[in-house]
């Protein structure tokens, strides 16, 4: 079974800068999985943001600002990266990755 690790416990960024969050997949080939990213703002329910499927297809939640989030997959390091552009107050949250094994 696959296992996920988010090595950064926290990430502190200046407003308008870029944040990159990592999710390391082990126990399964990342190219054979879909990785999903979610965020949980303080006091709010968890929300789906973006996913990258086994074939590289990216799906973004409607209503999420365009250009705000980028998702990538690096097979060499078995890592999925969530990039948050122009960090703002609304981006303060806990971000979770999740795995769907194909």
């Amino acid at each position: 079974a696959g296992h996920l690790e988010q090595p950064q416990i926290s990430s502190t960024k200046t407003l308008s800068k870029t944040a990159r969050l990592e999710c390391v997949v082990s126990g399964i080939t990342i190219s054979a999985t879909s990785v999903y990213w979610y965020r949980e703002r303080p006091g709010e329910v968890i929300q789906f943001l973006v996913s990258i499927s086994y074939d590289g297809t990216v799906r973004k939640e409607s209503g999420i600002p365009s250009g705000k989030f980028e998702v990538d997959r690096i097979p060499e390091t078995s890592t999925s990266t969530l990039t948050i552009h122009n960090v703002e107050k609304q981006d303060i949250a806990t971000y979770y990755c999740a795995l769907w094994e194909v």
């Epitope: 303080p42 006091g43 600002p65 705000k68 703002e88 107050k89 609304q90 303060i92 806990t94």
Partner: antibody, heavy 126, light 109 residues
Framework: EVQLVESGGGLVKPGGSLRLSCAAA????????MNWVRQVPGKGLEWVSS????????YYADSVKGRFTISRDNAKNSLYLQMNTLRAEDTAVYYC???????????????????WGQGTMVTVSS | EIVMTQSPGTLSLSPGERATLSCRAS???????LAWYQQKPGQAPRLLIY???SRATGIPDRFSGSGSGTDFTLTISRLEPEDFAVYYC??????????FGQGTKVDIK
């Protein structure tokens, strides 16, 4: 001195347009979310629209959605509200207001409008 | 849409008395997202309380906020002449609109 000054209000006919401006001074404008709030004279406050510091997150009240457009120019320290297809019920004093900034690096952050302009009157009448 | 209901509509009190203003949300609101404002005639509103209980800069300690979930309270421990005004609560939920209550007027008895 931290200050917000609105301009652009006036008398306009129903169906007409106006563009409100809000000039900010005394703080780093690009670090703050901004809001427009309106108030019919003698009545309560109504939130109209909000825009985040880098303009990624933009929200509108249902009553103005599709007619009003909020925008900002961080280089000019200015906030704008483009109001189209104006109706009689849009008649109000329009305030721009700064949202609370982020203090420290904590996950505990708050919302609230801590700096307000003096308001600009918009009258929609034939 | 979260509806904020304030009570009473008008509160008639004398200087030195304690004022208790209520704000009830139609659904649960995070304490981080609840604010109180004061507005005097001809003036813009002024932020009093944010995060349900934190006083804004320069606000005297006779003003205090409390509550959680759907019920919030603004208390003025001893009314000063300058405290007679209209008070509004406001919620910032997980999605707009960021609604205000209809206001409570505190006037001199």
């Amino acid at each position: 001195e931290v200050q917000l000054v609105e301009s652009g209000g006036g008398l306009v006919k129903p169906g007409g347009s106006l563009r409100l401006s809000c000039a900010a001074a005394g703080f780093t404008f690009s670090n703050y979310d901004m809001n427009w709030v309106r108030q019919v004279p003698g009545k309560g406050l109504e939130w109209v629209s909000s825009i985040s510091s880098s303009s990624s997150y933009i929200y509108y009240a249902d009553s103005v959605k599709g007619r009003f457009t909020i925008s900002r120019d961080n280089a000019k320290n200015s906030l704008y509200l483009q109001m189209n297809t104006l109706r009689a019920e849009d008649t109000a004093v329009y305030y721009c207001a700064r949202d609370l900034g982020i203090t420290g690096t904590t996950m505990d952050y708050y919302y609230g409008m801590d700096v307000w302009g003096q308001g600009t009157m918009v009258t929609v009448s034939s | 849409e979260i509806v904020m209901t304030q009570s009473p509509g008008t509160l008639s009190l004398s200087p030195g008395e304690r004022a208790t203003l209520s704000c009830r949300a139609s659904q649960s609101v995070s304490s981080s997202y609840l604010a109180w404002y004061q507005q005097k005639p001809g003036q813009a509103p002024r932020l009093l309380i944010y995060g349900a209980s934190s006083r804004a800069t320069g606000i005297p300690d006779r003003f205090s906020g409390s509550g959680s979930g759907t019920d919030f309270t603004l208390t003025i421990s001893r009314l000063e002449p300058e405290d007679f005004a209209v008070y509004y609560c406001q919620q910032y939920g997980s999605s707009p609109p960021y609604t205000f209550g209809q206001g409570t007027k505190v006037d001199i008895k």
